[in-house]
């Protein structure tokens, strides 16, 4: 007989999940020298503990605590680039600067990144069918719980000057939804963070407006000064030239506004 | 049929090293774990340690770090358990086990199990 | 490391009697337990797995129960081929441990 099975609105977890995370784990620690200690079979134990058996719909922070202990990561406090929207030019530029950091860029988001993950209650199966839906379905599932934990924690971390790519080309260039409105931003640290910058970045080549002026950032800027730390912004009008240029600083057409 | 056949027993002196072999037919051995799990005579179970062959990666209890090696051969479907430094205390019947890489199951397949003495 | 402790270590019953062996975890382990049964100069074999389901081809008067850190193995009516010893496994964490057995002996 069948069993019956929750059907979510969102995909199902992604295909071959376990053996992705492990061999992401296993890559990530051979690149990085001071995560050569992890045991990637045990994070691995410690990320399935966290939402399989459990009801898809009811994952906490908590659950995710046994992973988070062994993903501890040291990163400069001062190195830190947030982004909303924007991904992959955020991870563009940590390609390049080096010395710089995204969430993904850490053990635990590098593991999790672009992938969908959920089990069903009282078995221990993996539902590759399908997993709840943040609107849809319910908020606390175990792919949302995730990325709300390792951002709070992210940006518990920072300190001094932290930057933000932010997507000029949306009608909501800071959005209070996103995980930078509703976690990063409540979680910088007053008294460590001296600084929030955001960049934004420009989707039209021809599009020379002042995004720093627009509504929603004038709104970060408020939510940010009511909690004591300073706001900055700058437009980045020529996102390939910037990108360009952080490759090649001595480059002759780099001393231009980009 | 799964089947996990291992190497014949072994006589080893003190301070020497044993290898044993654990060669698994009937199944897709890329999508397996192999355990390592000894019991000394008359005495309960105690796990060694793990490898997956997919991705080439091994871990160990504490007790054994530093004296035993478990690897694994894609080619010939074999997994291997290398223990250095034996002393008389390391006599025992020593077993591959079988679980998936996710480690979401049991031990489901078993081998037939190498008695390994250690004497002088 | 997490400790799992069985008991009784050894019981005497009859065939047909009801057998129920208990295994505790020093710390929370969900549901990952599985039991074993082995008899002399045999490998274990595995019986139980998430702490309640029933392996494949292993006979109904075998059940599990618990969570957390108490856990059970009950065999219904114990038949004569059932004579042997029994441990549970934690697969929660590395490194993985054993309870030190549970050898079941005709009365």
């Known amino acids: 007989v069948p069993r019956w099975r929750q059907q979510w609105s969102g995909p199902g977890t992604t295909k071959r999940f376990p053996e992705t995370v492990l061999a992401r784990c296993v890559k990530y620690t051979e690149i990085h020298p001071e995560m050569r200690h992890v045991d990637c079979q045990s994070v691995w134990d410690a990320f399935k503990g966290a939402f399989i058996s459990k009801h898809p719909c009811n994952i906490t922070e908590e659950d995710y605590q046994p992973l988070m202990k062994l993903g501890t990561q040291t990163v400069p406090c001062n190195k830190i680039l947030l982004w909303s929207r924007i991904k992959d030019l955020a991870h563009q530029f940590t390609q390049v600067q080096r010395d710089m950091f995204t969430l993904e860029d850490t053990l635990l988001g590098y593991l999790a990144d672009d992938l969908t993950w959920c089990g069903e209650f009282n078995t221990s199966k993996i539902n590759y069918q399908s997993c709840p839906d943040w609107r849809k379905d319910c908020s606390n599932n175990p792919v949302s719980v995730f990325w709300k934990t390792v951002s709070r924690r992210f940006a518990e971390a920072a300190c001094d000057v932290v930057h933000v790519m932010l997507n000029g080309s949306r009608s909501k260039i800071f959005d209070k939804n996103s995980t930078f409105g509703s976690v990063e931003v409540h979680n910088l640290q007053p008294e460590k963070v001296q600084t929030l910058e955001a960049w934004v970045i420009h989707g039209g080549r021809e599009d020379s407006r002042d995004l720093c002026q627009d509504p929603t950032i004038k709104e970060l800027e408020s939510i940010i000064s009511k909690r004591n730390i300073q706001f900055s912004c700058k437009n980045i009008y020529r996102p390939d030239k910037f990108l360009q240029c952080v490759k090649n600083p001595e480059d002759s057409s780099c001393t231009s506004e980009i | 049929q799964v089947q996990l056949v291992q190497s014949g027993a072994e006589v080893k002196k003190p301070g020497s090293s044993v290898k044993v072999s654990c060669k698994a037919s009937g199944g897709t051995f890329s999508s397996y774990a192999f355990s390592w799990v000894r019991q000394a005579p008359g005495q309960g179970l105690e796990w060694m340690g793990r490898v997956i062959p997919q991705l080439g990666i091994a871990n160990s209890a504490q007790k054994f770090q530093g004296r035993v090696t478990i690897t694994a051969d894609k080619s010939t479907s074999t997994a291997y358990m290398e223990l250095s430094s034996l002393r008389s205390e390391d006599t025992a019947v020593y077993y591959c086990a079988r679980d998936d890489i996710a480690a979401l199951g049991p031990f489901d397949y078993w081998g037939q199990g190498t008695l390994v003495t250690v004497s002088s | 490391d997490i400790q799992m402790t069985q008991s009784p270590s050894s019981l005497s019953a009859s065939v047909g009697d009801r057998v129920t062996i208990t295994c505790r975890a020093s710390?929370?382990?969900?549901?990952?337990l599985a039991w074993y049964q082995q008899k002399p100069e045999k490998a274990p074999k595995s019986l139980i797995y998430?702490?309640?389901s029933l392996q494949s081809g292993v006979p109904s008067r075998f059940s599990g129960s618990g969570s957390g850190t108490d856990f059970t193995l009950t065999i219904s009516s114990l038949q004569p081929e059932d004579f042997a010893t029994y441990y549970c496994?934690?697969?929660?964490?590395?490194?993985?441990?054993f309870g030190q057995g549970t050898k079941v002996e005709i009365k």
């Open positions: 710390q929370g382990i969900s549901s990952w």
């Open positions: 998430a702490a309640s």
């Open positions: 496994q934690q697969y929660n964490s590395y490194p993985r441990t």
